[in-house]
Interface confidence: low
């Protein structure tokens, strides 16, 4: 229903705490360079204004749209042009163009320092002094670094953070309580970020229809006992929620997500037998739990897919009468039978089925033409299955760090023009797929591996879009979202690349590396590895392994030496010489 004051309506629905959190996230995602204090001031002003509208919906400006209200606030910031350059030009536009302009200026890779976690004691002190400000800082720091983070989920992670701090700060050994728990939240949040970015990319590049197809496949896998009408309703609602969040309409998004969770819990009987545990949870935990709820048990008596989609004499008639509904039904029926497939694979199969019907229904004898369509799915299914087997075998043999290095070599050869930091980031993320997915039961590996890889490759595409340097990457990123992963997998060594000159300073290290945390040490070594491949793109795995082992030995020796600086300055040049010789 229409409300006299949109801002009052959202404030009432969400409550002050979540209203403020979401407004803070929205501002932090739009203006990523502003400090927490600047944003906190804006949030307070907006909240105070919302309260006046709750008291009197007819008060001045209360009838304005949220985009108008928020946009006016952002555009009133002093020194906008000095700090944000051409983003300030957005303020010359009217809504809805102004909001579109803000969205286009979101930076997926802002030049902000990494979000460093303070040491335990300091963290607990500031948390106890002012939990609200502490959590505000968390929301601000995450949101500005991840401008498409799913806002209601970020509130959930902040709540997790809060619970961990409340528990651990009461313990004697705060550090050992906090570190593993916060690391766990961080890991989950980073995965959530790349997954959501993928959804927004799907929405931005291919529209709502593409996202809805993704949702139908995903929901059908999870809720195989729900009928097609129910799945369509859930997919439509989920599409609306994601469209709002991707579009910066965070209050509407969180409110509608809450409504969807409520609907699901009120209609468990027609959706799934697995929802009760989630529905018993409070607050944000409920929607989070529903978003990753386990698959319901598949109905035992499902007929073969061929009956309705290959053998039925009316296939072409049904397709012609309502293409989207017929294809949607196919996607639903195929997906509910295959929780062991990735959503990307299911969408590729639906695309293949559509292309087959387009071709065959125009021919003289359609059934003879489309009769073999299910058999033609076989190579499409085998390709990702082989990918999973090959990569999980390699992961089990090498471990996470070694597996990351293997991927780094592979991707540097595929796209050596891409900047080394981007290649290292991508390889480290792609390499985590082993730890994340290869330990799962067989039937869960494929969906885990491929959908995770697709999300990471989407980030590679976004970063490459900013400064396109590799024709290989451009080619794979220009195609459809579901074809990206197979495209990247199929890339081979870029023959057009002219190898980089060998620069000794690239491989010169100093004693400061010894005091770095293990993760930072790994990044330094992986940076050197990528540079080696750029110097010798056709180096063999054995050659590279020899060099990297030598390098690891050199670091180990010098970091244990009494006079580290002397060791690095004398042994370093010897290492560089040995590297050149090994790769000659």
């Amino acid at each position: 229903e229409a409300h006299k004051s949109e801002i009052a309506h959202r404030y009432n629905d969400l409550g002050e705490q979540h209203f403020k959190g979401l407004v803070l996230i929205a501002f932090s995602q739009y203006l990523q360079k502003c400090s927490y204090d600047e944003h906190a001031k804006l949030v307070q002003e907006v909240t105070d204004f919302a309260k006046t509208c709750v008291a009197d919906e007819s008060a001045a400006n209360c009838d304005k749209s949220l985009h108008t209200l928020f946009g006016d606030k952002l555009c009133a910031i002093p020194n906008l042009r000095e700090n944000y350059g051409e983003l300030a030009d957005c303020c010359t536009k009217q809504e809805p163009e102004r909001n579109e302009c803000f969205l286009q200026h979101k930076d997926d890779n802002p030049s902000l320092p990494p979000f460093e976690r303070p040491e335990a004691e300091a963290m607990c002190t500031s948390f106890k002094e002012n939990p609200t400000t502490f959590m505000g800082h968390y929301l601000h720091e995450v949101a500005r670094r991840h401008p498409y983070f799913y806002a209601p989920e970020l509130l959930y992670y902040a709540e997790q953070y809060n619970e961990i701090l409340t528990q651990c700060c009461a313990e004697a050994d705060k550090e050992s309580c906090l570190t593993p728990k916060l690391d766990g939240v961080k890991e989950k949040a980073l995965v959530s970020s790349v997954r959501q970015r993928m959804k927004c990319s799907s929405m931005q590049k291919f529209g709502e229809r593409a996202f809805k197809a993704w949702a139908v496949a995903r929901l059908s896998q999870t809720f195989p006992n729900a009928d097609f009408a129910e799945i369509t309703k859930l997919a439509t609602d989920l599409t609306k929620v994601n469209k709002e969040c991707c579009h910066g309409d965070l209050l509407e998004c969180a409110d509608d997500r809450a409504e969807l969770a409520k609907y699901m819990c009120e209609n468990q009987a027609t959706i799934s037998s697995k929802l009760q545990t989630c529905c018993d949870k409070p607050l944000l935990k409920k929607a989070h739990c529903l978003s990753e709820v386990e698959h319901d048990t598949m109905p035992a008596d499902l007929p073969a897919i061929a009956a309705d989609f290959v053998e039925d004499q009316e296939v072409c008639k049904n397709y012609a009468e309502a293409k989207d509904v017929f294809l949607g039904t196919f996607l639903y029926e195929y997906s509910r039978r295959h929780p062991d497939y990735s959503v990307s694979l299911l969408l590729r199969l639906a695309k293949k089925y559509e292309a087959t019907l387009e071709k065959c229904c125009a021919e003289a004898n359609p059934p003879a033409c489309y009769g073999t369509v299910l058999a033609e799915f076989q190579p499409l299914v085998e390709e990702p299955k082989n990918l999973v087997k090959t990569n999980c075998d390699l992961y089990e043999k090498l471990g996470e760090y070694g597996f990351q290095n293997a991927i780094l070599v592979r991707y540097t050869q595929k796209a050596p023009q891409v900047s080394t930091p981007t290649l290292v980031e991508a390889a480290r993320n792609l390499g985590r797929v082993g730890t994340k997915c290869c330990t799962l039961p067989e039937d869960q590996r494929l969906p885990c591996v491929e959908d995770y890889l697709s999300a990471i490759l989407n980030r590679v595409c976004l970063l490459h879009e900013k400064t396109p340097v590799s024709e290989h990457v451009t080619k794979c990123c220009s195609g459809s979202l579901v074809e990206r992963r197979p495209c990247f997998s199929a890339l081979t060594v870029d023959e057009t690349y002219v190898p980089k000159e060998f620069k000794a300073e690239t491989f010169t290290f100093h004693s400061d590396i010894c005091t770095l945390p293990e993760k930072e040490k790994q990044i330094k070594k992986q940076t050197a590895l990528a540079e080696l491949v750029k110097h010798k793109p056709k180096a063999t795995a054995e050659q590279l392994k020899t060099v990297m082992d030598d390098f690891a030995q050199f670091l180990d020796t010098c970091c244990k030496a009494a006079d580290k600086d002397t060791c690095f300055s004398t042994e370093g040049p010897n290492l560089v010489t040995r590297c050149k010789d090994a790769l000659a």
């Epitope: 009432n12 629905d13 969400l14 409550g15 002050e16 705490q17 979540h18 939990p131 809060n162 409340t166 809450a258 969770a261 409520k262 018993d280 949870k281 409070p282 607050l283 944000l284 409920k286």
Partner: nanobody, 116 residues
Framework: QVQLVESGGGLVQPGGSLRLSCAAS????????LAWYRQAPGKQRDLVAR???????HYADSVKGRFTVSRDNAENTLVLQMNSLKPEDTAVYYC??????????WGQGTQVTVSS
């Protein structure tokens, strides 16, 4: 949805005490924050005190040290213990429940009058 019913209001002399109760029913599992608001004639509704699901409390400056808010999650009740009452505490007191999944709920209100 959450339904709220207040009780315990009445007439009291300045310096006296009153104990307001609020019984919550319905989807009480979804509540994160419970609060008391008050509205004096011709004024807007103001926050008096609130308590989060974790038990942390917040009070309006005007009632700090005099009022205590508590909740019993098992019984789904919210209590406001009001001591050292002043004439300016006269108002209709409303119970409020904030939930992430449902719109906020308000009780019907209970009248508190502080007068000699």
């Amino acid at each position: 949805q959450v339904q709220l019913v207040e009780s315990g209001g009445g007439l009291v002399q300045p310096g006296g005490s009153l104990r307001l109760s609020c019984a919550a029913s319905g989807s009480t599992w979804s509540i994160n924050t419970l609060a008391w608001y008050r509205q004096a004639p011709g004024k807007q509704r103001d926050l008096v005190a609130r308590i989060s699901s974790g038990g942390s409390t917040h009070y309006a400056d005007s009632v700090k040290g005099r009022f205590t808010v508590s909740r019993d999650n098992a019984e789904n009740t919210l209590v406001l213990q009001m001591n050292s009452l002043k004439p300016e505490d006269t108002a209709v007191y409303y119970c409020y429940a904030q939930s992430t999944w449902y719109p906020p709920s308000w009780g019907q209100g209970t009248q508190v009058t502080v007068s000699s």
